[in-house]
Interface confidence: medium
């Protein structure tokens, strides 16, 4: 079986998928579902997954969830929260994705793949 995907490849794949679901998109993503905001720091892949995994029935983000599963080293299930969540702030999925995308591009440019 193939070995693990290099972090740089997984990050590019995640960026490309986030671009796919946001490009020229004005309709509310996932019917305007709200998710917990996260701190965009170390461990953000797991935190992002913990937030997005609570959105159900939204096919637009299935692939994003799958890529994040590959980037997060531990098992994540719905209802699970880490200290990285800003628990008093909920934002729309579309804004969450846009914030995450901008941060990931910054990481990629700086060569921070892990």
């Amino acid at each position: 079986s193939p070995g693990p995907v290099p972090p740089s490849t997984a990050l590019r794949e995640l960026i490309e998928e986030l671009v796919n679901i946001t490009q020229n998109q004005k309709a509310p993503l996932c019917n305007g579902s709200m998710v917990w905001s996260i701190n965009l720091t170390a461990g953000m892949y797991c935190a992002a997954l913990e937030s997005l995994i609570n959105v159900s029935g939204c096919s637009a983000i299935y692939r994003t969830q799958r890529i994040l599963h590959g980037l997060c080293p531990h098992k994540v299930s719905a209802g699970q929260f880490s200290s990285l969540h800003v628990r008093d702030t909920k934002i729309e999925v579309a804004q969450f994705v846009k914030d995450l995308l901008l941060h990931l591009k910054k990481l990629f440019r700086e060569g921070q793949f892990n």
Epitope: R12, E16, V19, N20, T22, N24, A27, K105
Partner: antibody, heavy 126, light 108 residues
Framework: EVQLVESGGGLVKPGGSLRLSCAAS????????MSWVRQAPGKGLEWVGR??????????NYAAPVKGRFTISRDDSKNTLYLQMNSLKTEDTAVYYC?????????????????WGQGTLVTVSS | SYELTQPPSVSVSPGQTARITCSGD??????AYWYQQKSGQAPVLVIY???KRPSGIPERFSGSSSGTMATLTISGAQVEDEADYYC???????????FGGGTKLTVL
């Protein structure tokens, strides 16, 4: 000043090939999504295709009438966009414009094609 | 393939309001963009993301969108606004661009 300058147009026979270039200046080319748009004489605008920035996957999409015949590429080190046109047909005769599809790509924004070149004329005729 | 539909021509007198429509099935979820093209010149973006006006575009240009219809409105049209106007958007995937057939605006 943001600027796009196309070159490489000219007269070519049906079945022939041509490569157009678009030199960009005044903005961070590597961040930008770039498009080609054409306009046949006396007709409307027609989207030809688009290439994303490398950081956004470098994905290339083509309009159905040119898919398989035209190839879009970019050289970020030279700030240049290319359109390789093969198996040309008389109906490919048009002014070809390059345009920035996303100068704000760095910020995850999409502004539409907000800067255009002056265009280069491609004539396909026997 | 996906299409955007515009009226071929619109005529108004100077000072009147011109409205140009653009219809497409994906417009409820995808933004519309409007371009002005004067004879022999490259297109110029006048409205982006349905309603936003780039810097340098006069305030008389505005855009709106409802359902499958986007509208470009020129309030108090002037003789210099006479041009071809094209709407642009993408198909539902966002991957393929498409222009409307264009509308010739006559201000006489």
């Amino acid at each position: 000043e943001v600027q796009l300058v196309e070159s490489g147009g000219g007269l070519v026979k049906p079945g022939g090939s041509l490569r157009l270039s678009c030199a960009a200046s005044g903005f961070t080319f590597s961040n930008a999504w770039m498009s080609w748009v054409r306009q046949a004489p006396g007709k409307g605008l027609e989207w030809v295709g688009r290439i994303r920035s490398k950081i956004d996957g470098g994905t290339i999409n083509y309009a159905a009438p040119v898919k398989g015949r035209f190839t879009i590429s970019r050289d970020d080190s030279k700030n240049t966009l290319y359109l390789q046109m093969n198996s040309l047909k008389t109906e490919d005769t048009a002014v070809y414009y390059c345009a920035t599809d996303q100068v704000g790509a760095y910020y995850g924004d999409y502004y539409g094609m907000d800067v255009w070149g002056q265009g280069t004329l491609v004539t396909v005729s026997s | 393939s996906y299409e955007l539909t515009q009226p071929p021509s619109v005529s108004v007198s100077p000072g009147q309001t011109a409205r140009i429509t653009c219809s497409g099935d994906a417009l409820p979820e995808k933004y519309a963009y409007w371009y002005q093209q004067k004879s022999g010149q490259a297109p110029v973006l006048v409205i982006y993301e349905d309603t936003k006006r780039p810097s340098g575009i006069p305030e008389r240009f505005s855009g709106s969108s409802s359902g499958t219809m986007a509208t470009l409105t020129i309030s108090g049209a002037q003789v210099e606004d006479e041009a071809d106007y094209y709407c642009y958007s993408t198909d539902s995937s966002g991957n393929h661009g498409v222009f409307g057939g264009g509308t010739k605006l006559t201000v006489l």
